[in-house]
């Protein structure tokens, strides 16, 4: 049964969801933050919660600016304890099939269990074969960075491109992107859409005897990977005399699919494979994500992992009040589904974490983008929300005036390091940066009343435009530095956010139905651009801008 | 605890055939290269035959090319090793090997023996 692991087929059936709803009419809805802060002299040091990390660094979550109070906090928690996210989480920790609509588990912690402990799949010890995917990256990594690893005409290795897309492509370019501050020796480049121009444009900055192609398909079917994968074989054998045995030196797999992979041309021994327990867009700490290890060292990807393990430790061990992600889970519940919030906005304000909420956005939209329980119900309540953001302060120059002044309620997540990379100029951008991460989160809460903007000079119809309503919800993630364990730690942290939402919608947060129609039609379409006949096949709107684009193809 | 054990060896007369299996528990297995290697008295172990993990492809050494069919269930966690043709110089201990993907990772069988004579 798709419901074994949860006794419930909706959420509203909650006792503790009833709760909830009469505690949002009698005093959440009119909650103001501002005046619980006045009320209660400790509500930021009860609200704010400090993660350490494995080697000690720290992430302060702070809480206290979100409309909530101690019994809002508590009806929450009694809401998880009822939903059995604790038990949901156990089952995936145990390795046990909780993605119940594929019958898989859903393993993704064990990939960065450092700590080699038994983690147990279908009876099998799973650590030992992680272990040994690792040491594999390790070495070949190694090889490579040093330049033990030669191209074709024996020339070092300078460049990697790595073809993949989803979640073969979109952890992997955050990732590199969040840490470039901590690349070395070679330059790493991203195709995945099957555009033309990606890989087009990536190919006139590369030199075939410097460049190692990294093709990330777990299948080695996927349609747009395969077709750049070729295009990139045809470029470089015509760039290095039609002669199939470099293709060795030059290409490597991370796929399970061995014989596609030596069809190819691939060396199999250069082939890194991931289990089926392992969803695309948990991917990343796998062996997907060996374009990281090559780019950042081997030794700062462990740290990434073990940054993410520290999470996963914290949230298994760590009870429910102090819990600092299912905590985050729960307030994304309490928008979601009391405010009637349908977005959470993500705005770091660290350029170098410019793709982290493109890559929360597919770990959320994907995961809890579900209408259906595990009951096998259609819910009555929403889900999945819509996350977006961009880097601050771009994105207070852009979108920030709808999250002030518009009609919808974002709760806002914010996120800054304390130490730049980069403290240039006596370390004046920094502080520029930082005061305005604090200055927005307060501007949000406290907003501007009509007596102030009339204090401030304003008259009449100008009056209005000028408030600021306020009490408009943040949660601050302030860490020391962002170092592969912080990422780690942070993107582990988003993970069992989103586990926590969906273990309270009662929805398979670990499958993804919902891109598989799109893919079908388009393989029908693509015979139909084929030829030149006229498509009449489809409905008027579909026929008709197919026919318009034949005519002007 | 991971286990391969060995079956299905014994005495066959020359020209006769054999199948061997390999039974694996405590692995992944579909993710696992499986092969059977050999090692006659007095000899260094060699390889007979591969079947990569998703069973699209077969490697022979030439000496059992056309004699011998290697294939797995990944059901039932089994390698085969289907010896047909058998000469005495077939004789040997028969080991099953699982190598994880293509990484350092690999699990050995105790052997079994095969003794073709007449």
């Known amino acids: 049964s798709n419901n074994s692991f949860t006794n419930f087929k909706l959420a509203t059936e909650l006792p503790a969801w009833s709760k909830l709803q009469k505690i949002y009419e009698s005093q959440g809805k009119t909650l103001s933050v501002k005046q619980e802060f006045q009320k209660d002299a400790k509500r930021f040091e009860k609200l704010n919660k400090t993660f350490t990390n494995y080697d000690g660094s720290k992430i302060l979550f702070d809480y206290s600016k979100n409309l909530v109070n101690d019994e809002i906090i508590a009806a929450l928690i009694e809401l998880a304890k009822e939903a059995n996210v604790t038990g949901l989480r156990d089952a995936m920790f145990k390795g046990e099939h909780i993605n119940s609509t594929e019958d898989r588990a859903v393993y993704h912690v064990a990939l960065r269990n450092r700590a080699n402990k038994p983690m147990y799949v279908d009876g099998v010890n799973v650590a030992p074969e992680v272990d040994s995917v690792l040491k594999h990256m390790k070495e070949f990594s190694e090889q490579v960075r040093s330049g033990e690893w030669k191209g074709y005409t024996g020339k070092k290795i300078t460049d990697v491109v790595n073809i993949g897309i989803g979640g073969s492509d979109l952890g992997p370019v955050m990732v590199t992107e969040a840490l470039k501050h901590y690349a070395g020796v070679l330059d790493v480049h991203f195709v995945s859409n099957i555009d033309g121009t990606h890989i087009a444009e990536t190919l006139k900055v590369v030199d075939p005897e410097t460049t190692l192609f990294l093709i990330a398909s777990k299948t080695f079917t996927t349609a747009e990977t395969i077709t750049n994968a070729n295009t990139a074989k045809n470029w470089f054998l015509s760039k290095t005399g039609n002669d199939p045995s470099h293709i060795a030196k030059h290409f490597a797999a991370l796929s399970t699919n061995e014989t596609e992979v030596a069809k190819f041309g691939i060396d199999t021994k250069n082939m890194f494979g991931f289990e089926s327990w392992v969803g695309g867009r948990y991917s990343v700490w796998s062996a997907i994500g060996l374009s990281v290890a090559l780019y950042i060292g081997y030794d700062n990807f462990e740290a990434f992992l073990k940054g993410a393990e520290a999470v996963d430790n914290h949230f298994t061990q760590t009870p429910l009040e102090d819990n600092i992600p299912l905590l985050g889970g729960l307030l994304s519940v309490w928008y979601n589904n009391f405010f009637g919030a349908q977005t959470h906005l993500v705005a770091p304000f660290d350029q170098y974490l410019h793709r982290f909420p493109a890559y929360l956005q597919q770990l959320s939209m994907e995961s809890n983008g579900k209408s259906v329980t595990r009951g096998n119900v259609f819910t009555d309540y929403s889900t999945g929300s819509i996350l977006f953001g961009e880097p601050a302060t771009n994105a207070q120059h852009s979108f920030f005036q709808l999250v002030h002044q518009g009609t919808k309620l974002i709760p806002s997540d914010f996120i800054l390091a304390a130490q730049s990379h980069n403290p240039i100029e006596n370390k004046l951008h920094q502080k520029m940066l930082a005061s305005n991460f604090f200055a927005q989160a307060e501007a949000l809460m406290v907003g501007k009343d009509e007596e102030q903007v009339k204090a401030e000079g304003a008259t009449g119809g100008l009056v209005p435009h000028k408030v600021f309503s306020g009490n408009r919800p943040t949660t601050s993630i302030l860490a020391q530095k962002i170092t592969p364990a912080t990422l780690g730690a942070l993107i582990a942290y988003y993970e069992h956010v989103t586990f926590t939402e969906g273990a309270i919608w009662n929805i398979n947060s670990f499958d993804q139905w919902g891109v598989e129609l799109g893919k079908v039609l388009a393989k029908v379409i693509g015979k139909e651009l084929d030829n030149s006949s006229t498509i009449s096949t489809h409905d008027a709107s579909t026929n008709g801008l197919i026919n318009q684009f034949k005519e002007w193809m | 605890q991971v286990q391969l054990v060995e079956s299905g060896g014994g005495l066959v007369q020359p020209g006769g055939s054999l199948r061997l299996s390999c039974a694996a528990s405590?692995?992944?297995?579909?993710?696992?290269?499986l092969s059977w290697y050999r090692q006659a008295p007095g000899k260094e172990r060699e390889l007979v035959a591969a079947?990569?993990?998703?069973?699209?492809?077969?490697n022979y050494a030439d000496f059992v090319k056309g004699r011998f069919t290697i294939s797995r269930d990944n059901t039932k966690n089994t390698v085969y090793l289907q010896m047909n043709s058998l000469k005495p110089e077939d004789t040997a201990v028969y080991y099953c090997?699982?190598?994880?993907?293509?990484?350092?990772?690999?699990?050995w069988g105790q052997g079994t023996q095969v003794t073709v004579s007449s």
């Open positions: 090997k699982a190598q994880y993907f293509s990484t350092p990772l690999t699990y």
């Open positions: 405590g692995i992944t297995f579909p993710s696992y290269r």
């Open positions: 079947i990569t993990s998703d069973g699209g492809t077969t």
